[in-house]
Interface confidence: medium
Amino acid sequence: SPVPFGPEGRLEDKLHKPKATQTEVKPSVRFNLRTSKDPEHEGCYLSVGHSQPLEDCSFNMTAKTFFIIHGWTMSGIFENWLHKLVSALHTREKDANVVVVDWLPLAHQLYTDAVNNTRVVGHSIARMLDWLQEKDDFSLGNVHLIGYSLGAHVAGYAGNFVKGTVGRITGLDPAGPMFEGADIHKRLSPDDADFVDVLHTYTRSFGLSIGIQMPVGHIDIYPNGGDFQPGCGLNDVLGSIAYGTITEVVKCEHERAVHLFVDSLVNQDKPSFAFQCTDSNRFKKGICLSCRKNRCNSIGYNAKKMRNKRNSKMYLKTRAGMPFRVYHYQMKIHVFSYKNMGEIEPTFYVTLYGTNADSQTLPLEIVERIEQNATNTFLVYTEEDLGDLLKIQLTWEGASQSWYNLWKEFRSYLSQPRNPGRELNIRRIRVKSGETQRKLTFCTEDPENTSISPGRELWFRKCRDGWRMKNETSPTVELP
């Protein structure tokens, strides 16, 4: 393979040179100041020591400056996510400088070689920032590095090498291979900027994890657990792309981090909130919907600066496309008795009725098992803003929809052939909205009828003593 960079940081690729053609050597890292939202505008190339382009292209020394850093590339060209991100930044921050860091020659190589080139690219960015700092009014605190995949670690190196501290680094699904478990100086880490926020969308605990699993920022956000992204299944991809392949699924999930960030820029009125939690399973149980003590935050561009003593892992659910925002609810269901449960876990569904809209029928995911004489917590989420909740319909699915459950039911029947009907008793459901932090209690419509069995439903209305917690704060509004 070619020598990736020479002494001046220039690409010296002597392969595939057409005969009798000009072979001007170009810098391997170029800084393209985007002067328009249109990708057709060529922008202006900035280079250290050359002040004229800064003047010609109206570089605003007092404004925010974004550096967008791409990652490894198989095609050797810029992908469309870059255009969408540039456009969104220009829309949101009209006076800002948006600089695309073009390191395509060093990224369009074997992945391992591209990884080895991240350090030199980080150095180039740091040199550019050091030079800009020599200018009056330019502040490193106004600099926001946004790196996707391998570009996130490039941003980390840049933040590490620069003289001073950059204001913010956003890591968009930082690359996993060769970085997972690496020393903090060899990957993106919290000490690379004043605020480091990270979105993880393609992490896998089995097989190859394209995105890094470990937390690497001040806040690390794992949408949908950080692994399977809605709308990115093979079926979804096959439906939307002429030649859908597993590669498209990987691209869809890995690139989702970028689109979530773009969404936070363009759909400012529909912010998505993430909630601090120790792990994905606890979040799925609905345990982690608190906003107390900075336990929740907006995701993407609108994230509030949090410099925690240790990494803060945060979770949320999203829709399959823009706007990605969903509305999270914690449901606490106290099961005070049950009859003849057998081996099989019940399959519950809820429908929420609100002042603005009614939800679809939502499954209650049983992460472990239903506990008797205990409060069972569930997470449900809706794509619509339901407004204030009025009533809840709880349904116990009758006929099993999985072969596994059918088999378990059959075994239960064999062991207890005269098994009378299974039954659960539920008096109330406590609901907490993640987005408003409001808590409400719902009681059965008929206080005498609290039992539910397969194929039946139970209705709950706001209890007379419906309550909301006064000391909780909402991510959107401060509650009294």
């Epitope: 001007e24 393209n32 328009s36 249109d38 990708p39 057709e40 505008h41 060529e42 922008g43 202006c44 010609d56 292209c57 095609s75 060209i77 810029f78 992908e79 469309n80 870059l82 255009h83 969408k84 456009s87 695309v100 073009d102």
Partner: antibody, heavy 119, light 106 residues
């Protein structure tokens, strides 16, 4: 190899509309903006507008803005340019041209579609 | 809009001679692009970002200039170089082309 194949020649009456297609092959259609450029006989080149096939965003020359519409069908990797309220001076050759976002030039062109406007 | 004026309109030269084509912009542009067009064919990119040679273009073609004045030079004309040449800018929409310079055999 990269190819842009345009639809055949058209003869239209003044006031009518024409829709020219440009079928792309040999590359990922959604990764490049498609532009439309026209050329009158023996004259220079004139940029009309563009479409980003990835999400359908369009950009037009003000001169044609109220008459031109760019669309695309990603399932068949085809871009379309429709020009309405045709006049005799629209008798020109229409080209589609591929533009690499941030690469900065028209690297591949269609073969051209001749549109004749005559009563 | 930015108007690009090419001169001369026609250049009559012999094979082996040097051709110098000029393109002047009505206001400053960041970069200039040059295309070659032969009768009945679509334009073909020669130069991008003012001085960069497009893939497969012979080294006898070169571009230079800045601001409002740009030049395309063909160091030694080959028979296949006789064609019309257009300059173009991407600095400001609408993206405009020059009127063209026809290089013909003397």
């Amino acid at each position: 190899q990269v190819q842009l194949v345009q639809s055949g020649a058209e003869v239209k009456k003044p006031g009518a509309s024409v829709k020219v297609s440009c079928k792309a092959s040999g590359y990922t259609f959604t990764e490049y903006t498609m532009h439309w450029v026209r050329q009158a006989p023996g004259q220079g080149l004139e940029w009309m507008g563009s479409i980003n096939p990835y999400y359908g965003g369009t950009s037009y020359n003000e001169k044609f803005k109220d008459r031109v519409t760019s669309t695309r069908d990603t399932s068949i990797s085809t871009a379309y340019m429709e020009l309405s309220r045709l006049r005799s001076d629209d008798t020109v050759v229409y080209y589609c041209a591929r533009y690499g976002n941030y690469v900065g030039y028209f690297d591949y062109w269609g073969q051209g579609t001749t549109v004749t406007v005559s009563s | 809009e930015i108007v690009l004026t090419q001169s001369p309109a026609t250049l009559s030269l012999s094979p082996g001679e040097r051709a110098t084509l000029s393109c002047r912009a009505s206001s400053s542009v960041h970069y200039m692009y040059w295309y070659q067009q032969k009768p009945g064919q679509a334009p073909r990119l020669l130069i991008y970002y003012t001085s960069n040679l497009a893939p497969g273009i012979p080294a006898r073609f070169s571009g230079s200039g800045s601001g409002t004045d740009f030049t395309l030079t063909i160091s030694s004309l080959e028979p296949e170089d006789f064609a019309v040449y257009y300059c173009q800018q991407f600095t400001s929409s609408p993206y405009t082309f020059g009127g063209g310079t026809k290089v013909e055999i003397k």
